[in-house]
């Protein structure tokens, strides 16, 4: 259980402000499942405040990891029968300490709300809720106070002076004298061979066995060849099952081992530590982490959770590292900001995912009939007659560079230019001298100055203006 900055939300910050040390308190409020979460209705089912909270002394400039929550449980006494479906509201409050605190002593840091379905007497349910920049990890369960028993705490098991049929330590239930109070039941999955319990929802291991469900043999040096001791000195056995052996995930869930325990990936329609909770509708609020529930008006129709960015799973219960999907192209650096993804592009690339190469022709249009030409790691527009500029958007004066040789007169034309040559010269650019004796015309301009190439002219014109 912890309260702290969520992953991808920047440098973790302290809940305390500059005015010195502070304490965190948690207010838990229970509302009927039918109430609207957004309304400030009364905590009709009950409310409670955490106690014995530690003091945090971090200052705003320091880095603060997730804060461990106090060991003490927050007990919320509820009135009447346990409804099963309810709204759970958890508020995180900061109390400023010190003589010079000044200003308000109490501030609401975060408030998470969710609708849940939970039977009394069941195991701890785990949850992660995020609001703003804070993330709260917590567990919750509902338990009946004697003499109440049952999933709704609606049956009473009262002691009687006469001996009952229930056996020592167990009482008959009124108004159901034929029923007895529920026994102390071990945590689901506790090994029937190697585990037992004396308190509900625990799993104690017999000698030679360990693990959260007592399925892991204790290794000792007296057993050789990878074998382990059996129970009650029964000799050495082959290693026992791991946390996922026997697949603790129900309803088609898939199991993965996590530091000696297990984690279930549940199919749609199921959730819970072991995918054991089913038949839920959108009214039960099955979508975690702000997921939007669609469909599932009745238990027989499936609901779908539309998860916010950064979460996945059939109930939006799993945080996903979206950068692991490598969304940034062309070597861009991925940044998961929590509320959005950002790509920091390498030089020469642009776009939300760095998908645009600024130095290639893909997706780059040259205006006015120009064509894109790649070369040497760069791109340029080869413009049609009469246009210039980087993207051929500028109108060009074809006569500006005096393309007509030997005093020829230049006339701009819609298709380019026309040279009117001086007497004794001919050619498109008046580049040939006419010999009176009928000899062949010879070039009058040096070789290589192909001024008649309007594209080259415009290309140079482009560079001239930039």
């Amino acid at each position: 259980h912890s309260f702290g900055p969520g992953p991808g939300l920047g440098t973790p910050r302290s809940p305390c402000n500059a005015r010195g040390p502070c304490r965190l308190f948690f207010r838990v409020c229970l509302k009927p499942g039918v109430s609207q979460e957004a309304t400030e209705s009364l905590c009709a089912l009950g409310a409670a405040l955490s106690t014995s909270v530690p003091v945090y002394t971090e200052h705003p400039g320091e880095s603060a990891a997730a804060l461990p929550l106090p060991d003490g449980l927050v007990r919320v006494p509820f009135r009447d029968a346990w409804p099963g479906t309810f709204s759970l509201v958890i508020e995180t409050w900061r109390e400023q300490l010190g003589e010079h605190a000044g200003g308000p002593a109490w501030n609401l840091l975060a408030r998470v709300v969710g609708r849940r379905r939970l039977a009394a007497g069941g195991p701890w349910a785990r949850d992660v809720q995020r609001t703003g920049t804070w993330e709260l990890h917590f567990s919750y369960r509902a338990r009946c106070e004697p003499p109440a028993v049952g999933a709704a705490c609606a049956r009473l098991c009262r002691s009687r002076s006469a001996p009952s049929r229930c056996g020592p330590g167990l009482r008959p239930c009124t108004p159901f004298p034929d029923e007895c109070e529920a026994p102390s039941v071990c945590r689901p999955g506790c090994s029937p061979e190697h585990g037992y319990c004396e308190e509900p929802d625990e799993c104690r291991c017999l000698e030679g066995w360990t693990g959260p469900l007592c399925t892991v043999p204790v290794s000792t040096s007296s057993c050789l060849n990878s074998r382990v001791p059996g129970p009650a000195s029964t000799g050495c056995l082959l290693p026992g099952p791991g946390p996922c052996d026997g697949n603790p995930c129900a309803n088609g869930g898939s199991c993965s081992e996590t530091s000696g325990s297990f984690e279930c990936a549940c199919p749609r329609g199921f959730y819970g530590l072991r995918c054991e909770v089913s038949g839920v509708t959108c009214a039960d609020g099955p979508c975690f982490n702000g997921g939007l529930c669609v469909g599932g008006e009745d238990p027989d129709s499936a609901y779908v959770c539309h998860c916010p960015p950064g979460f996945q799973g059939s109930n939006c219960e799993k945080r996903v590292d979206r950068c692991s999907l490598q969304p940034c192209q062309n070597g861009g650096l991925c940044l998961d900001l929590g509320h959005a993804l950002r790509c920091r592009c390498r030089a020469g690339f642009a776009g939300p995912r760095c998908e645009h190469d600024l130095d290639d022709c893909a997706g780059r249009a040259c205006a006015n009939g120009g064509t894109c030409v790649e070369g040497g790691g760069s791109r340029r527009c080869s413009c049609a007659l009469g246009f210039g500029g980087r993207d051929c958007r500028e109108r060009a004066d074809p006569c500006a560079s005096r393309p007509c040789a030997h005093g020829g007169r230049c006339y701009a034309h819609f298709s380019g230019l026309v040279c009117a040559c001086a007497p004794g010269y001919m050619g498109v650019r008046c580049e040939f001298a006419v010999r009176p004796d009928g000899a062949d015309a010879v070039p009058a301009a040096p070789r290589g100055l192909r001024q008649a190439d309007p594209q080259r002219f415009l290309h140079h014109h482009h560079h001239h203006h930039h």
């Epitope: 529920a182 689901p188 029937p192 061979e193 190697h194 017999l206």
Partner: antibody, heavy 120, light 107 residues
């Protein structure tokens, strides 16, 4: 290796008392959390839980048979004894003993069973 | 007491087929339900406990699901040795009770 074995009469007369013994090895009823129970099965019918006893001498009985049943243990001998009074032909069944841990009310390890016939 | 009702009473299938056995509780037993297999002349053997945990040495073709009042034992591909009687049992409260059994026979 954990084993459990039932023993007792194969035939009893109506109104008599049946005494069955479960002798086990591989574990001890002095171990915290460990218990031994009895389950019976009439021929061709379903299983029926009868009684349980645990290391701390805590006993549990089926409500429908509680007045007729007594379960005891002899820890040093690794034995559990079930007595059932006022036997009737409908009590004809195979009687099994099995191990069950406290709070984990399943039966992970069973004996082979002994058939008891109630007939005059 | 909690009554466990198993269905069908008899299920006739061939080896290699998929078997689905049902157990329904008269009131919620959470996930505190086990499945046993019993072959003729033998004691029952624990297959599944707490609805979906396989007991030691049980093949992966056996799987359990469900919670509350409705539970299912599935055998993904029947082997010849799987034809037997199957019982469910709860540990939700006292008294412990068993279902009446489902006989799985070769078709």
């Amino acid at each position: 290796q954990i084993t459990l074995k039932e023993s007792g009469p194969t035939l009893v007369k109506p109104t008599q008392t049946l005494t069955l013994t479960c002798t086990f090895s591989g574990f001890s009823l002095s171990t915290r959390g460990v218990g031994v129970g009895w389950i019976r099965q009439p021929p061709g019918k379903a299983l029926e839980w009868l009684a349980l006893i645990y290391w701390n001498d805590d006993k549990r009985y089926s409500p429908s048979l509680q007045t007729r049943l007594t379960i005891t243990k002899d820890t040093p001998k690794n034995q559990v004894v079930l007595t059932m009074t006022n036997m009737d032909p409908v009590d004809t069944a195979t009687y099994y003993c099995a191990r069950s841990n406290w709070g984990n009310w399943y039966f992970a390890l069973w004996g082979r069973g002994t058939l008891v016939t109630v007939s005059s | 007491e909690i009554v466990l009702t198993q269905s069908p009473a008899t299920l006739s299938l061939s080896p290699g087929e998929r078997a689905t056995l049902s157990c329904r509780a008269s009131q919620s037993v959470s996930s505190y339900l086990a499945w046993y297999q019993q072959k003729p002349g033998q004691a029952p053997r624990l297959l599944i406990y707490d609805a979906f945990y396989r007991a030691t040495g049980i093949p992966a073709r056996f799987s359990g699901s469900g919670s509350g009042t409705d539970f299912t034992l599935t055998i993904s591909s029947l082997e010849p040795e799987d034809f037997a009687v199957y019982y469910c049992q709860h540990r939700s409260n006292w008294p412990i009770t068993f279902g009446q059994g489902t006989r799985l026979e070769i078709k």
